[in-house]
């Protein structure tokens, strides 16, 4: 089930998914001067079963000026560039992603893709927050948010993170020592 809202915005912080739940959709967006090929996919879709998940469809961009050229490649890891993972985020380096059952990894870039990635998350998706460069994290609890559904409405839990203006950065999970476990997260479910 699609999350019909966005993860919370935390001042001076960005968020990222470590892996994407099955059902997640990624818009096939092209950079300026390029467009999706005529019969090309609108989205990539994370599909699969409990043992293996992968992205269905391939995004393909072609020059807006050219009718018959298509560009679509799977680059080597060293070719991967910094990306945005939703339309409101700032670029962050890809991180190593554990193979979670029922989840897809970050899809590799396609040639001439837009600078921002627009993901459509599903219920159960978790995203992790980090403070932007120049800000330090003060944790009251886990710096994460989960999309939940209550009474047919979707909402994201509030991450327990404050970013203060000190010259130090906190990293995503896997890039520093582990933080508090998710079990301690306050739920604060909204009433119907």
């Amino acid at each position: 089930e699609l999350c019909d809202d966005d993860p919370p915005e935390i001042p001076h912080a960005t968020f990222k998914a470590m892996a994407y739940k099955e059902g997640t959709m990624l818009n096939c967006e092209c950079k300026r001067g390029f467009r999706r090929i005529k019969s090309g996919s609108l989205y990539m879709l994370c599909t699969g079963n409990s043992s293996h998940s992968s992205w269905d469809n391939q995004c393909q961009c072609t020059s807006s000026a050219t009718r018959n050229t298509t560009k679509q490649v799977t680059p080597q890891p060293e070719e991967q560039k910094e990306r945005k993972t939703t339309e409101m985020q700032s670029p962050m380096q890809p991180v190593d992603q554990a193979s979670l059952p029922g989840h897809c990894r970050e899809p590799p870039p396609w040639e001439n893709e837009a600078t921002e990635r627009i993901y459509h998350f599903v219920v159960g998706q978790m995203v992790y927050y980090q403070c932007v460069q120049g800000y330090r994290a003060l944790h009251r609890g886990p710096a994460e948010s989960v999309c939940k559904m209550t009474h047919g409405k979707t909402r994201w839990t509030q991450p327990q993170l404050i970013c203060t203006g000190e010259m130090e950065t906190s990293q995503f999970p896997g890039e520093e020592k582990p933080q508090a476990s998710p079990e301690g997260r306050p739920e604060s479910e909204t009433s119907c």
């Epitope: 089930e1 019909d4 809202d5 059902g23 609108l42 989205y43 339309e87 409101m88 219920v123 047919g152």
Partner: antibody
Framework: QVQLVQSGAEVKKPGSSVKVSCKAS????????MHWVRQAPGQGLEWMGY????????EYNQKFKDKATITADESTNTAYMELSSLRSEDTAVYYC?????????WGQGTLVTVSS | DIQMTQSPSTLSASVGDRVTITCSAS?????MHWYQQKPGKAPKLLIY???DLASGVPARFSGSGSGTEFTLTISSLQPDDFATYYC?????????FGQGTKVEVK
């Protein structure tokens, strides 16, 4: 209480445009996406797209990508849908519906009739 | 796109009848949602997340199913229930609805 009040019925000539409004009240307008749904006479419901009023981001059903433009005005808590290059097959009732999951609140609908 | 196929398209029934409407999705979905619409009115949320009744909906309505096959049941049809019913998926874009099932007086 939550209310979505849409603009009145419109009769338009082929080739012209129309802008339908949907004024929201009773909740925080920017906290929910606003979706638009079309119903042609005697037909079923078709999802057209949505807008995130807080940032103006839109997502469209590809079928309506070149037909509809969805906008929002935070200052008046109003969402708009403009239909361009109208043809007789655009004759329908257009509904706005509050998102955030299932469509729990709907506007009363706006009938747009395209006729020469 | 996920196609939603409702059956039957029209259902003739009498007050007190048990009525069943089915909705088949062309791909597996997480949940089905159901709306009721009366002539000249906007659709009204009836059942969400497959089996949960929306606020104010009588207990004679129920929903069930999983994967691609879902059902809406009215245990004992009442005069107020003559309307058109739509199934709806929001598991993937574009969001889609079934073509509708009109429940009419026999």
């Amino acid at each position: 209480q939550v209310q979505l009040v849409q603009s009145g019925a419109e009769v338009k000539k082929p080739g012209s445009s129309v802008k339908v409004s949907c004024k929201a009240s009773g909740y925080t307008f920017t906290s929910y996406r606003m979706h638009w749904v079309r119903q042609a006479p005697g037909q079923g419901l078709e999802w057209m797209g949505y807008i995130k009023p807080s940032r103006g981001y839109t997502e469209y059903n590809q079928k309506f990508k070149d037909k509809a433009t969805i906008t929002a005005d935070e200052s008046t808590n109003t969402a708009y849908m403009e239909l361009s290059s109208l043809r007789s097959e655009d004759t329908a009732v257009y509904y706005c519906a509050r998102g955030g999951g299932v469509f729990d609140y709907w506007g009363q609908g706006t009938l747009v009739t395209v006729s020469s | 796109d996920i196609q939603m196929t409702q059956s039957p398209s029209t259902l003739s029934a009498s007050v007190g009848d048990r009525v069943t409407i089915t909705c088949s999705a062309s791909s597996k979905i997480s949940y089905m949602h159901w709306y009721q619409q009366k002539p000249g009115k906007a659709p009204k949320l009836l059942i969400y997340t497959t089996s949960d009744l929306a606020s104010g909906v009588p207990a004679r309505f129920s929903g069930s199913g999983s994967g691609t096959e879902f059902t809406l049941t009215i245990s004992s049809l009442q005069p107020d229930d003559f309307a058109t019913y739509y199934c709806h998926q929001r598991s993937t874009y574009p969001l889609t609805f079934g073509q509708g099932t009109k429940v009419e007086v026999k």
